[in-house]
């Protein structure tokens, strides 16, 4: 990423902090939080922006978990442990030695316990659904519309590859996006469901991390797309490993 | 086919007002970002405006800020400029054009220019 | 940044292959050719990449890092014109070009 040297800005990442002094003078930006690099060209991941966001508090939200079969980010935010890459570590632990394994989005998906929980593997969520209700409009969105302009918001604005939209469903006012991506889908440079369905809700709420523009401007021929509330669920290529105790 | 076509040009005198009218055809106008540019005599492009298909964003380059307008009228297809204070470097060929990337976080970038106008000319001179 | 960097001239003979570079933008590029000035530029790529489905294959784009790259394979006698980059820059949240690259056909 390269700008005016007096005053360089990451385009893709509000949470930064940026300054001129990469190779040629050229801009480089580092991860509130963190402090690692990020590359502005495209999305930065999901685990240096909670981190990024936990460095500067806000109230922490909550979901509700509507399937035992879906994760829903019920814990709200905790600052993540990221690996070198920027991805969610897969054993999270807070200050009390509370430990957790968590997927690819930093969703938990196992009880809680103590510095002995082992996590062997960073498990991939492969599937997002996330499930919007819009405000109420003159009349129902045209389908087609709703979904050219859905798929279209997720390739132009987060580059994500239009084969990893799985498909949009519309029953009004209910509004819902398949994002899937196995791990054998997603090649060097793809973006990340999880990073594009986080930058998405975050667009959503009002608190785009894009610098510029900011924020979005969603319509269906002309007819603002206004969404008051959103639940994503994410599923994993492995089930998570919850105790009975949790399931009633 | 897609076209735009500039209107309003002509010789104009410093510290007036010009309104330049750019009409499309041949494409959903609603659904694209719109951008001015110009040319002056001799010299490179400038970018100079962009309108998103909304109409609720504009953004303006630092040599006509605070001085241009940019507008559009998505039920006639039809983007305007208001430039005012005119000066002796407003002196150009001001073309219309379209954005290919109305969602994009970049979508005020020139990279997404895919349709131009022939233009219109501009002299501002006493 | 004033506007994006690019090589003032370029100079080739038929058949040869050409590259453009265009740097100092945050984000996509776009590579128009003007054959004369007033006249309105044609555009031969734009978002990067992306060629319009009248310009001849011999055009492409790409982009590395923050560097995009205008390439005609087998350059024409007619292909003879000044190329402009357009870009944006993140440090302004506007579009820019560049000072425009003058190619000749030898």
């Known amino acids: 990423h390269t700008a005016a040297q007096d005053n360089c800005t990451c385009p893709t990442n509000k949470m930064t902090v940026c300054s001129p002094d990469g190779p040629g003078g050229r801009c480089q930006c580092r991860a509130l939080g963190s402090g690692m690099a990020v590359d502005c060209s495209t999305l930065t991941s999901k685990c240096l922006l909670l981190k990024a966001r936990m460095s500067a508090p806000k109230n922490a939200r909550t979901l509700v978990r509507p399937s035992e079969h879906a994760l829903v980010d019920n814990d709200g935010l905790y600052d993540p442990d990221c690996d070198p890459e920027g991805r969610f570590k897969a054993r999270q632990c807070n200050q009390t030695s509370v430990c957790w394994c968590v997927n690819s989005v930093g969703v938990r998906r196992t009880d809680k316990g103590d510095l002995s929980l082992r996590c062997d593997e960073l498990v991939r969520t492969h599937h997002i659904l996330i499930d919007l209700r819009h405000r109420p409009t003159a009349g129902a969105f045209n389908h087609s519309d709703l979904d050219a302009e859905l798929r279209r918001l997720f390739r132009e604005r987060y580059r994500l590859h239009p084969k990893f939209v799985a498909a949009v469903h519309y029953e009004q006012p209910t509004i819902q996006i398949e994002l899937r991506q196995n791990t054998s889908q997603k090649a060097a440079g793809d973006v990340d469901i999880g990073d594009a369905a986080y930058y998405f809700e975050r667009d959503i709420k009002g608190e785009s991390l894009f610098q510029g523009r900011g924020g979005l401007d969603l319509r269906v021929r002309g007819e603002p797309l206004q969404v008051e509330r959103t639940l994503i669920y994410y599923l994993d290529e492995i089930p998570p490993k919850f105790s009975m105790k949790r399931l009633t | 086919a897609v076209t735009l076509d500039e209107s309003g040009g002509g010789l104009q005198t410093p510290g007036g007002g010009l309104s330049l009218v750019c009409k499309a055809s041949?494409?959903?106008?609603?659904?694209?970002?719109m951008f001015w540019v110009r040319q002056a005599p001799g010299k490179g492009l400038e970018w100079v405006a962009v309108i998103n298909r909304s109409g609720s964003y504009t953004n303006y380059a630092p040599a006509v800020k605070g001085r241009a307008t940019i507008s559009r009228d998505n039920g006639q297809s039809t983007l305007r400029l208001q430039l005012n204070n005119l000066r002796a470097e407003d002196t150009g060929t001001y073309y219309c054009?379209?954005?290919?990337?109305?969602?994009?976080?970049?979508?005020?970038?020139?990279?997404?220019?895919?349709?131009w106008g022939h233009g219109t000319e501009v002299i501002v001179s006493s | 940044a004033l506007a994006l960097t690019q090589p003032s001239s370029v100079s080739a003979n038929p058949g040869e292959t050409v590259k453009i570079t265009c740097s100092g933008g945050?984000?996509?590029y776009g590579w128009f050719q003007q054959k004369s000035p007033g006249i309105a530029p044609v555009i031969v790529i734009?978002?990067?990449?992306n060629r319009p489905s009248d310009i001849p294959s011999r055009f492409s784009g790409s982009k590395s890092g923050s560097t995009g790259t205008l390439t005609i394979t087998g350059v024409q006698a007619e292909d003879e014109a000044v190329y402009f980059c357009?870009?944006?820059?993140?440090?302004?949240?506007?579009?820019?070009f560049g000072a425009g690259t003058t190619l000749t056909v030898l």
């Open positions: 734009f978002n990067d990449d």
């Open positions: 945050s984000g996509s």
């Open positions: 041949g494409f959903d106008f609603i659904d694209y970002d």
């Open positions: 357009g870009g944006y820059d993140g440090s302004t949240d506007a579009g820019i």
């Open positions: 054009a379209r954005g290919a990337c109305t969602h994009c976080w970049d979508a005020d970038s020139a990279g997404y220019i895919d349709t």
